[in-house]
């Protein structure tokens, strides 16, 4: 009913991993480097990164009716953010601080996306936009904004999985 092949996701596992993602996203945010807060208003990320919106079926009723839509949206977002965290935005200069949890965050995003899409199953894939290469002077701001957007995304995903674990688990 929820993942390809008609099976449900491991709601409890997804809940635990999404909660871990929330913690990691919040701990990573201040550690990406000094951020001049005047930069915050430069550009909006809203059109450039995935968001979970009203029509995505992630409300309790939508999850009851068919959680497939919501889970596919979450999966797409996880893949997008996983790609971002593995890109030169985070791997290039200036280097991340040694104690940055971005590596763990990257691995956890991949782990949750794999839980949602087991081996051999495939969502109808929505094209993930290709990223322009980042330049060194752009990266601090990009890291800051991506992690801030990711916080919002995983917070919604965690609520979805908490609801699923409580009400939709077999």
């Amino acid at each position: 009913r929820a993942v390809p092949g008609g099976s449900s996701p491991a709601w409890t596992q997804c809940q635990q991993l999404s909660q871990k993602l929330c913690t990691l996203a919040w701990s990573a945010h201040p550690l990406v480097g000094h951020m001049d807060l005047r930069e915050e208003g430069d550009e909006e990320t809203t059109n450039d990164v995935p968001h979970i919106q009203c029509g995505d079926g992630c409300d309790p009723q939508g999850l009851r009716d068919n959680s497939q839509f919501c889970l596919q949206r979450i999966h797409q977002g996880l893949i997008f953010y996983e790609k971002l965290l593995g890109s030169d935005i985070f791997t290039g200069e200036p280097s991340l601080l040694p104690d940055s949890p971005v590596g763990q965050l990257h691995a956890s995003l991949l782990g949750l996306s794999q839980l949602l899409q087991p081996e051999g199953h495939h969502w109808e894939t929505q094209q993930i936009p290709s990223l322009s290469p980042s330049q060194p002077w752009q990266r601090l701001l990009l890291r800051f904004k991506i992690l801030r957007s990711l916080q919002a995304f995983v917070a919604v995903a965690a609520r979805v999985f908490a609801h699923g674990a409580a009400t939709l688990s077999p």
Epitope: E39, D42, T45, N47, D48, P129, S132, P133, P136, Q138
Partner: antibody, heavy 123, light 106 residues
Framework: EVQLLESGGGLVQPGGSLRLSCAAS????????MHWVRQAPGKGLEWVSV????????WYADSVKGRFTISRDNSKNTLYLQMNSLRAEDTAVYYC????????????????WGQGTLVTVSS | DIQMTQSPATLSLSPGESATLSCRAS??????LAWYQHKPGQPPRLLIY???HRATGIPARFSGSGSGTDFTLTISSLEPEDFAVYYC????????FGQGTRLEIK
């Protein structure tokens, strides 16, 4: 219509200083990173420097690092290039340039250019 | 830094002919390459971005192709106003320009 107008060029002796300005109009200046690009006589284009939209971050070509300072005044829609310890090889037409794309994941190609201002370093 | 090499340095052709300009990067730049036209006393003009996308207002006779390290700008039927210097620019890592190709009337 986007307009960029450079000024401040002229003749200066080696070791001297000069400040270039670029007055911008026709777009929301404070939302765009801005660049300086130069062309020496008979030579190709060379990227010089960039400044982030608020002025919080800057970057320079190795050839000018430590001698040139890029800055901006968003209240005046103006970009600056302070050039110190000038050398003969800094002789060039200096252009200010704006990217073709805004947004977060932007590509660094130049859609809009000023007419340029000539800097001549000679004794 | 990534070096950009353009060839030929000078290309002599007549109006109506087709021009092929080459640009080679010292390492892969993906498709993060732009082409500019530059005439004396004027600022450079963006022709092509992302290797093959024509900029706004650029005539269809200009086309770009290539990826990785080898790129081509083709002008299908030269107009008198096309004779100028052409530069390629990579933006995969920092920003570097080629040394230019001068397209002159034969």
């Amino acid at each position: 219509e986007v307009q960029l107008l450079e000024s401040g060029g002229g003749l200066v002796q080696p070791g001297g200083s000069l400040r270039l300005s670029c007055a911008a109009s026709g777009f929301t200046f404070s939302r765009y990173e801005m660049h300086w690009v130069r062309q020496a006589p008979g030579k190709g284009l060379e990227w010089v420097s960039v400044i982030s939209p608020s002025g919080g971050r800057t970057w320079y070509a190795d050839s000018v690092k430590g001698r040139f300072t890029i800055s901006r005044d968003n209240s005046k829609n103006t970009l600056y290039l302070q050039m110190n310890s000038l050398r003969a090889e800094d002789t060039a037409v200096y252009y200010c340039a704006k990217l073709g794309t805004g947004g977060v994941f932007k590509s660094t190609y130049f859609q809009h250019w000023g007419q340029g201002t000539l800097v001549t370093v000679s004794s | 830094d990534i070096q950009m090499t353009q060839s030929p340095a000078t290309l002599s052709l007549s109006p109506g002919e087709s021009a092929t300009l080459s640009c080679r990067a010292s390492q892969s730049v993906g498709t993060y390459l732009a082409w500019y036209q530059h005439k004396p006393g004027q600022p450079p003009r963006l022709l092509i971005y992302d290797a093959s996308h024509r900029a706004t207002g650029i005539p269809a006779r200009f086309s770009g192709s290539g990826s990785g390290t080898d790129f081509t700008l083709t002008i299908s039927s030269l107009e008198p106003e096309d004779f100028a210097v052409y530069y390629c620019q990579q933006y995969r890592s920092l920003i570097t320009f080629g040394q230019g190709t001068r397209l002159e009337i034969k």
